[in-house]
């Protein structure tokens, strides 16, 4: 089997963690988040060729069926395998609060 | 906010559970699985428009950034939210065994 982390499409083309710089306005948060003003958003972007970072058996099945029926079954997709928490200072009905979100920033990626 | 389960693209076009009939050959399992001979594979297929079955905050962010930077950030992707287990009768080095796989069949879907 091919090395699950070796991208056959060339460096940086396959599913991996990317960082996108975004303002509160970009994120659609300007009306409810006070801080931070900008976020380095980590997200999973890239192609999922055969055997590359397959998350599980389902991803293997999906790839095999995609090769057979590409118009019916899409290729596996690059999504977060886990997340890093982030704390936001946000407006609430009663004032301002500090809130931790556990599902905001991707920590690492795989293909599903 | 739009109902998270109402597809704005028309019935059946958005992220949902599909069933694909597959043989052991289709799945690439013919050399190690004895039974079943065929599988009704449940998988997640369909588009992920804004606010449709968003898995978490990360999916919301991804959609907002996709709208801003469609060439850089892909739209959220339709993937399993949970799985149904399946038991396979498989060949092993020492003979034949019954093995349960927890990550084989999608149970329900969301957008990440």
């Amino acid at each position: 089997a091919r090395n699950g982390d070796r991208c056959p499409l060339g460096p940086g083309r396959c599913c991996r963690l990317h960082t996108v710089h975004a303002s509160l306005e970009d994120l659609g948060w300007a009306d409810w988040v006070l801080s931070p003003r900008e976020v380095q958003v980590t997200m999973c972007i890239g192609a999922c060729p055969s055997q590359f970072r397959e998350a599980n058996m389902h991803a293997q099945i999906k790839m095999n069926l995609h090769r057979l029926k590409p118009d019916t079954v899409p290729a596996p997709c690059c999504v977060p395998a886990s997340y890093n928490p982030m704390v936001l200072i946000q407006k609430t009905d009663t004032g301002v609060s500090l809130q931790t979100y556990d599902d905001l920033l991707a920590k690492d990626c795989h293909c599903v | 906010a739009r109902n998270g389960d109402r597809c704005p693209l028309g019935p059946g076009r958005c992220c949902r559970l599909h069933t694909v009939h597959a043989s052991l050959e289709d799945l690439g399992w013919a050399d190690w699985v004895l039974s079943p001979r065929e599988v009704q594979v449940t998988m997640c297929i369909g588009a992920c428009p804004s606010q449709f079955r968003e898995a978490n905050m990360h999916a919301q962010i991804k959609m907002n950034l996709h709208r801003l930077k469609p060439d850089t950030v892909p739209a959220p992707c339709c993937v399993p939210a949970s799985y149904n287990p399946m038991v396979l009768i498989q060949k092993t080095d020492t003979g034949v065994s019954l093995q349960t796989y927890d990550d084989l069949l999608a149970k329900d879907c969301h957008c990440v």
Epitope: S35, M86, I89, K91 | -
Partner: antibody, heavy 121, light 107 residues
């Protein structure tokens, strides 16, 4: 370089008010929020509150609610903390600090030199 | 409010010693904890943030660890300039709270 320079020491009578200033330089003032912390003689650090340098939104410590007001003036890059109805147990060194907030969380990376407020009759 | 309990309240140590200070939160605070050093008559100085990240310019002999409720600040080899009081601080929820402080004294 980043600097927070506070106003000078004050001596006040019980019942009076005090207003401490904190002038920032070396960075874009509105991009970083401010907290105020105080320290009574020989005691530990006590968080007083937080203010958004951009919007002016505030959060105050419950025990100071109704007596404290934090404000900012972006035109002069200055934060202010006013404490009213002073009591002897308000005698402390008052610090302002810059809030750094990013994906690694919140921390207070630059501090003013402190302002001693003495409340005595 | 989240209570932060530091121990010990004071420790006597010699130059070159390894010093460990612990901080316990009354409820889980993820990794949202910072450590500060304060010398007499001076403002606090940030050492560690996000439980284990070293602030720029702080010597590598300082390190932090922990998550949830239990945290540790370690000075691997105590230097003369490290004699000071150390405070932990949670930034998980308002009100932000500090530990009571640990004074590191010369033995």
């Amino acid at each position: 370089q980043v600097q927070l320079v506070q106003s000078g020491a004050e001596v006040k009578k019980p019942g009076a008010s005090v207003k401490v200033s904190c002038k920032a330089s070396g960075y874009t003032f509105a991009s970083y929020d401010i907290i105020w912390v105080r320290q009574a003689p020989g005691q530990g650090l006590e968080w007083m509150g937080w203010i958004s340098a951009l919007s002016g939104d505030t959060v105050y410590a419950q025990k100071l609610q109704g007596r404290v007001t934090m404000t900012t003036d972006t035109s002069t890059s200055t934060a202010y903390m006013e404490l009213r109805s002073l009591r002897s147990d308000d005698t402390a060194v008052y610090y302002c600090a810059r809030t750094r907030h990013d994906t690694s969380g919140i921390r207070f990376d630059y501090w003013g030199q402190g302002t001693l407020v003495t409340v005595s009759s | 409010d989240i209570q932060m309990t530091q121990s010990p309240s004071s420790v006597s140590a010699s130059v070159g010693d390894r010093v460990t200070i612990t901080c316990r939160a009354s409820q889980g605070i993820d990794s949202w904890l910072a450590w500060y050093q304060q010398k007499p008559g001076k403002a606090p100085k940030l050492l560690i943030y996000a439980a284990s990240s070293l602030q720029s310019g702080v010597p590598s002999r300082f390190s932090g660890s922990g998550s949830g409720t239990d945290f540790t600040l370690t000075i691997s080899s105590l230097q003369p300039e490290d004699f000071a009081t150390y405070y932990c601080q949670q930034v998980h929820s308002f009100p932000i709270t500090f530990g009571g402080g640990t004074k590191v004294e010369i033995k």
